[in-house]
């Protein structure tokens, strides 16, 4: 049976614009099966740290060790892959840091950097000084292992010089890399000595070798690409949001709900209301009113703005998010003060998430 009674019809618009809600691109940690993985929670001044995996509380067990700001996973398995978060609870607020773990056969060191320079790598030589190919910028080649989330763009670079100017070709897993070997092909920017693959997919995983050669010699360098696959998960809401707020009668207030969901999320802002002087229906369930929801006619659904508030607007506001996998919700309280009282930071009321699930 439903856990609440809706006060009014809240039929949703038939279509929602496709949006990808993501708090940030989480850092990716990659481990091979059987290895141990240690991650430090990158939050400052953490009095108490709690951990979650795919939005579910993570506690210590025979393979998971939680010591202070460190999470250790012993003997990692593919099932340990997912979206992790550590939340630092402080006296007045809390903060959450997200990261992804991918347990795969390929070890790698994170995302590639952007090619902001490049032209300077194309070195011209005095025509008399014949020279075999050589690397001109080994710093840009140090990171051999690249773990990239699916759908991202990858760039491998082999800045080189030589006289005559060397040519560059690319191999994948030791064989000639042809355009037809991947959907959408790839780009080679000879000026920048780079190979670019857009919207990488799992089949792009492998070893990529640049071969730079002229008539005086040949050099090569190999990169390893791992495409980190996402795992579908229920929506995850940033801890501490929406935050409690207070304002005077006639003031304006804003609640913010930060959502992490790869799958299309549907966001609703819900408030407990009264009907005929009662907060509960005949079935004993609370009356709830949907104030705003994501859809074609709705602007930024992650924000609920209330203008010219009255005392009747005081109460609990719930941010409820759903995707095709599951739901999550958190709530905050609005305190409306009489006009003569200036609003202060809420301390007395602490929002405990009103999980309907």
């Amino acid at each position: 049976r439903p856990s609440f009674s809706l006060v009014e019809d809240t039929t949703l618009e038939p279509e929602e614009p496709p949006t990808k809600y993501q708090i940030s691109q989480p850092e990716v940690y990659v481990a091979a099966p059987g290895e141990s993985l240690e991650v430090r929670c990158l939050l400052k001044d953490a009095a108490v740290i709690s951990w979650t995996k795919d939005g579910v509380h993570l506690g210590p067990n025979n393979r998971t060790v939680l010591i202070g700001e460190y999470l250790q996973i012993k003997g990692a398995t593919p099932r340990d892959s997912g979206l992790y978060a550590c939340t630092a609870s402080r006296t007045v607020d809390s903060e959450t840091w997200y990261f992804m773990v991918n347990v795969t056969d390929a070890i790698s060191s994170g995302d590639d950097e952007d090619d902001t320079d490049g032209a300077e790598d194309f070195v011209s030589e005095n025509s008399n000084n014949k020279r075999a190919p050589y690397w001109t910028n080994t710093e840009k080649m140090e990171k051999r292992l690249h773990a990239v989330p699916a759908a991202n763009t990858v760039k491998f670079r082999c800045p080189a010089g030589g006289n005559p100017m060397p040519t560059m070709r690319w191999l994948k897993n030791g064989k000639e890399f042809k355009q037809e070997h991947r959907i959408g092909g790839y780009k080679v920017r000879n000026q920048h000595w780079s190979l670019i693959m857009e919207s990488v997919v799992p089949s792009d995983k492998g070893n990529y070798t640049c071969v730079v050669e002229n008539e005086y010699g040949s050099i090569n360098h190999t990169y390893h690409l791992d495409v980190v696959e996402r795992s579908p998960h229920r929506p995850i809401l940033q801890a501490g949001l929406p935050a409690n707020a207070s304002t005077v009668v006639g003031g304006d207030v804003e609640f913010v709900c930060k959502v992490y969901s790869d799958a299309q999320p549907h966001i609703q802002w819900i408030k407990h209301v009264e009907k005929n002087g009662s907060k509960y229906g005949p079935d004993g369930l609370p009356y709830l009113k949907v104030l705003k929801h994501s859809g074609i006619n709705s602007s930024n659904a992650e924000v609920l703005a209330l203008f010219n508030v009255t005392e009747a607007d005081a109460g609990e506001y719930i941010c409820k998010v759903s995707n095709y996998i599951g739901q999550a919700n958190q709530s905050a309280w609005l305190t409306v003060l009489p006009k003569q009282q200036a609003p202060g930071r809420e301390k007395e009321i602490t929002a405990s998430p009103d999980y309907l699930e």
Partner: antibody, heavy 112, light 106 residues
Framework: QVQLVQSGAEVKKPGSSVKVSCKAS????????MHWVRQAPGQGLEWMGA????????DYSQKFQGRVTITADESTSTAYMELSSLRSEDTAVYYC?????WGQGTLVTVSS | EIVLTQSPATLSLSPGERATLSCRAS?????MYWYQQKPGQAPRPWIY???NRATGIPARFSGSGSGTDYTLTISSLEPEDFAVYYC?????????FGQGTKLEIK
């Protein structure tokens, strides 16, 4: 491991109702939507609706609104799909699905 | 509602060949999902979030695309790959499927 076990085949008369059950095990039943999808003989797949057992939220395809009722019993980890005012074109295999796992399907035949 | 159109309806190829299945949406979706179905069996989730293989799906399968155009590619067909493949969108209710592409042995 995750399992979704559906009730057996049904033969129904036009105008009547059918209620198909789907018993879940191997995961937290209340934390995931249970979807219902049907497939007429030799045809494609059609999403009908879903329920979130944790709070009994439902989401229906407009095509079936008013004729389909999806419910869930958390105590037995079972979801139900009831389709009323049956007609011959409702003859199909009905599947329950937790996004990454599907039941084996229940054949409902509507015939006079 | 978002209409998904799969092409071709039937694809006749031999083992070892490359297969390219297309799915076009009537309006933009953020991700595409693919299922494989064999006769007498329930559909099996195959690719999720456009390009991620479901557990146990071989690396010869890859998904790509964005907006309204999506593709499922099988780099080198194995005998067990011959089946019907459906695309699906989870972007807006009703969550529609394509009509399916039947991949058959030539």
């Amino acid at each position: 491991q995750v399992q979704l076990v559906q009730s057996g085949a049904e033969v129904k008369k036009p105008g009547s109702s059918v209620k198909v059950s789907c018993k879940a095990s191997g995961y937290t039943f209340s934390s995931y939507w249970m979807h219902w999808v049907r497939q007429a003989p030799g045809q494609g797949l059609e999403w009908m609706g879903a329920i979130y057992p944790g709070n009994s939220d439902t989401d229906y395809s407009q095509k079936f609104q008013g004729r389909v009722t999806i419910t869930a019993d958390e105590s037995t980890s079972t979801a139900y799909m009831e389709l009323s005012s049956l007609r011959s074109e409702d003859t199909a295999v009905y599947y329950c699905s937790k996004f990454d796992y599907w039941g084996q399907g229940t054949l409902v035949t509507v015939s006079s | 509602e978002i209409v998904l159109t799969q092409s071709p309806a039937t694809l006749s190829l031999s083992p070892g060949e490359r297969a390219t299945l297309s799915c076009r949406a009537s309006s933009s979706v953020n991700y595409m999902y693919w299922y494989q179905q064999k006769p007498g069996q329930a559909p099996r989730p195959w690719i999720y979030l456009t390009s991620n293989r479901a557990t146990g799906i071989p690396a010869r399968f890859s998904g790509s695309g964005s907006g309204t155009d999506y593709t499922l590619t099988i780099s080198s067909l194995e005998p067990e790959d011959f089946a019907v493949y459906y695309c699906q969108q989870w972007s807006s209710n009703p969550y529609t499927f394509g009509q399916g592409t039947k991949l058959e042995i030539k």
